[in-house]
């Protein structure tokens, strides 16, 4: 498999046919296919070299792992999606053993000194062919000459069959399956041929693709694949719930943010809860997991404006939710990204001198931002889009908090809300999902760059429009949402969460 | 300045209870964990668990989860390790240390000078 | 539970030396390690938490590094008032466990 391993060192080879027997629309097709590969290892921020080749008679190279310019996804991405299927009309016939030696050459090393660190390169060829060679000879050989310079299968002891891997699409009207099966690596329990149905899928294609075990601490990252669970797709969320005796208890989310920590709203506890009567589950798990203690933001008080005639003040409503185990990360247990830290910088793939302002901006520009909450509907986890009102819409939409249960003598909407808030809700741009109560303490989320990112959590709406359990279709232009904007509370965030090793900015 | 202080040593026979204590100053004793630690010739240095002064969650090593019991009192700053019945095995010197701040994970930053308790018949 | 194994269990030294001791921890405990000094009749005393951190008001002569399970305490000039036994111990994961101990003698 590709082990997309930050740390390590990796060179994949695009290998495009673009013969005549494969024709524009599948070309075009298998390209688009290469584009969403590239894009899918670069959310790992893993940053391999690429080598680029297309072929029919001849083969071109368009991108050589030498270049400085072949470990940049973005450039990568563009020389691929300026190659046209035109470009090899005039000879188009089906050398695809040429179009190996092409790789061959980016491989091997001048004067025959193997550079240092060779061996510790894992390599990685994608051909996209109908198997349909018919000039040049038999390309398997080329394969067993790249197999031999790289020492793979040679020493018993260390046979380093993981250091490459040959996969086959393929594509086209008509596909010689006995050609395309012999080109591809045969490895116990792991695919390396897969068909133009399956490109419908890319996500499941790129589950059997990618080994992500040195990559499961990266925060906001999901796995899409039609097999997967709830949890695979938000694999942060958590699920809160407070038993208190003859009160009967209070539904709340969260999300996962570190090994030990989960974020939520400070107002789904009072001070009164005991750490056992708090039950945190993760992943879809079953069993609940025990809390050590819930630290409050300090400025939080719901009854801090009550001589002022407000009866709930939801000001710096977060809370964190410290577990007494560490949680053990998988494909359904994985942290979120917190505004200004490394991995998030990491995540956006911004320079390594990214301000904590630059990420502001680049997640909360002030204009109208598309954002996503998960909710719990009918026993499955589902995203809603929204967008915050960040821009002009701004004022109108935080206006909208008097027609709030008790605010609505409020002389001055500051008073509750404060700039701790960000809102979501009402008909424009779009008509937003709003929260129910239920979704408090979950995270409003960034989704940028194949990534996910926490800006804000979850606090109090303006209507309940999830009446009786069900969310209500119509509801009026007034119910908005108010989350805790995230930035606004990070120096509480970065005290808390300094031993888990995120890396404030 | 941050202090530690313990009750004084015990000698005890097998069977009997005790508790001893551990009061801090020189901080808020609400806002850190209070460790209990003890150490033999035999065996070294052995956490045996810890209390949160502020809520009384407390925690143990499972290895003594049936042998002592944590406690505090947050109104006079004050930690306590208690025995129902002692055993010749109990003898040991024991050590109330604070822990990081409730939330972080920090080691034991000022212990307190040590109780020695001997269990004999 | 995780256990922590030290080496050497003891050691000779002058005064000026430079000292490393090691600990090794049965799992990962990402960066997690402390290591204490104890003189006799004392309470141990913190050096260093996080694997590397220096605690307030200890000597710079003292640091810490490593992370994952391989860990160590180096002295870089040994001092009179630095023979005495040092433990490491992870604050990873409950139970916090210890090392059995380093003995640092006069040679």
């Known amino acids: 498999k590709i082990v997309l391993d930050p740390s390590g060192s990796m060179n994949i080879y695009l290998v495009l046919d673009g013969s005549d027997s494969i024709g524009a629309s599948n070309f075009t097709g298998a390209k688009k296919c290469l584009v969403n590969l590239i894009e899918k290892v670069a959310s790992y921020g893993v940053k391999p070299r690429y080598g680029l080749v297309t072929y029919a008679t001849y083969p071109k190279i368009w991108v050589k792992v030498s270049e400085a310019d072949s470990s940049n996804a973005d450039w990568v991405t563009k020389q691929l999606n300026e190659i046209n299927y035109e470009d090899h009309k005039l000879k188009s016939g089906t050398n695809t053993k040429k179009a190996l030696q092409a790789v061959y050459s980016m491989m091997s090393w001048p004067d025959d000194v193997p550079p240092e660190g060779w061996n510790r390169t894992r390599h990685v060829i994608i051909l996209m062919t109908d198997g349909l060679h018919n000039m040049g000879g038999d390309p398997i050989t080329v394969i067993d000459e790249i197999r031999d310079l790289l020492y793979i299968g040679k020493d018993r002891k260390n046979p380093r069959e993981d250091y490459l891997d040959v996969y086959v699409f393929g594509v086209g009207p008509l596909v010689n399956q006995v050609n395309i099966n012999a080109l591809a690596s045969k490895k116990d329990n792991e695919q390396h041929v897969f068909k133009v149905k399956d490109m419908e899928n890319l996500e499941d294609v790129f589950y059997q693709m990618i080994d992500e075990s040195q990559s499961l601490s990266l925060c906001g990252m999901v796995w899409e694949h039609r097999k997967g669970t709830d949890y695979h797709k938000q694999p942060w969320q958590a699920k809160i719930s407070v038993i208190r005796p003859s009160k009967g208890h209070e539904s709340c989310m969260g999300a996962v943010v570190s090994e030990y920590f989960v974020l939520t709203a400070a107002h789904c506890f009072t001070v009164d809860d005991k750490e056992h009567s708090i039950k945190v589950s993760v992943g879809g798990e079953k069993r609940d997991l025990e809390i050590e203690v819930v630290l409050f933001h300090p400025n939080y008080n719901i009854n801090g404006k009550k001589e002022a005639g407000i009866p709930e003040f939801y000001d710096y409503d977060v809370a964190l939710i410290k577990l007494k185990n560490k949680l053990k990360y998988g494909q359904t247990i994985r942290p979120i990204c917190l505004p200004c830290t490394e991995g998030t910088t990491r995540a956006l793939r911004l320079p390594p001198t990214t301000t904590c302002q630059q990420q502001k901006e680049e997640l909360l520009p002030a204009q109208d931002i598309k954002a996503l909450f998960v909710s719990e509907e009918e026993k499955k986890l589902t995203r809603k889009e929204v967008y915050i009102k960040n821009g002009d819409k701004k004022g109108s939409c935080e206006r909208d908090a008097q027609y709030a249960p008790g605010y609505d003598k409020v002389k001055d909407i500051s008073e509750v809300v404060t700039p701790r808030f960000l809102c979501t809700g009402g008909v424009s741009p779009y008509a937003d999902p709003n929260t129910c109560r239920g979704d408090s303490g979950g995270p409003l989320i960034v989704h940028k760059r194949s990534r996910f990112i926490q800006v804000g959590v979850i606090s109090w709406g303006v209507v309940d429009v999830c009446k009786n359990q069900k969310r209500q279709k119509q509801v009026p232009a007034h119910a908005r949402d108010f989350h805790i904007n995230l930035f606004q509370v990070l120096p509480w965030l970065k005290e808390k969460l300094q031993d888990e090793d995120l890396g404030f900015l | 300045e941050v202090q530690l202080v313990q009750s004084g040593a015990e000698v005890k026979k097998p069977g009997e209870s005790l508790r001893i204590s551990c009061k801090g100053s020189?901080?808020?004793?609400?806002?850190?964990?209070i460790h209990w630690i003890r150490q033999s010739p035999s065996r070294g240095l052995e956490w045996l668990g810890y209390i949160n002064p502020n809520t009384g969650y407390n925690d143990y090593n499972q290895k003594f989860k049936d042998r002592v019991t944590i406690s505090a009192d947050k109104s006079i700053s004050t930690a306590y390790l208690q025995w129902s019945s002692l055993k010749a095995s109990d003898t040991a010197m024991y050590y109330c240390?604070?822990?990081?701040?409730?939330?972080?994970?920090?080691?034991?930053?000022?212990w307190g000078q040590g109780t020695l308790v001997t269990v004999s018949s | 539970d995780i256990q922590m194994t030290q080496s050497p269990s003891s050691l000779s030294a002058s005064v000026g030396d430079r000292v490393t001791i090691t600990c090794r921890a049965s799992?990962?405990?990402?960066?997690?390690l402390a290591w204490y000094q104890q003189k006799p009749g004392k309470a141990p005393k913190l050096l260093i938490y996080s694997g590397s951190t220096l605690q307030s008001g200890v000597p710079s002569r003292f640091s810490g590094s490593g992370s994952g399970t391989e860990f160590t305490l180096t002295i870089s000039s040994l001092q009179s008032e630095d023979f005495a036994v040092y433990y490491c111990q992870q604050h990873d994961e409950y139970p916090w466990t210890f090392g059995q101990g380093t003995k640092v003698e006069i040679k």
């Open positions: 240390a604070r822990g990081g701040q409730l939330g972080l994970r920090r080691a034991m930053d000022y």
């Open positions: 020189g901080y808020t004793f609400t806002n850190y964990w």
């Open positions: 799992k990962s405990i990402s960066k997690y």
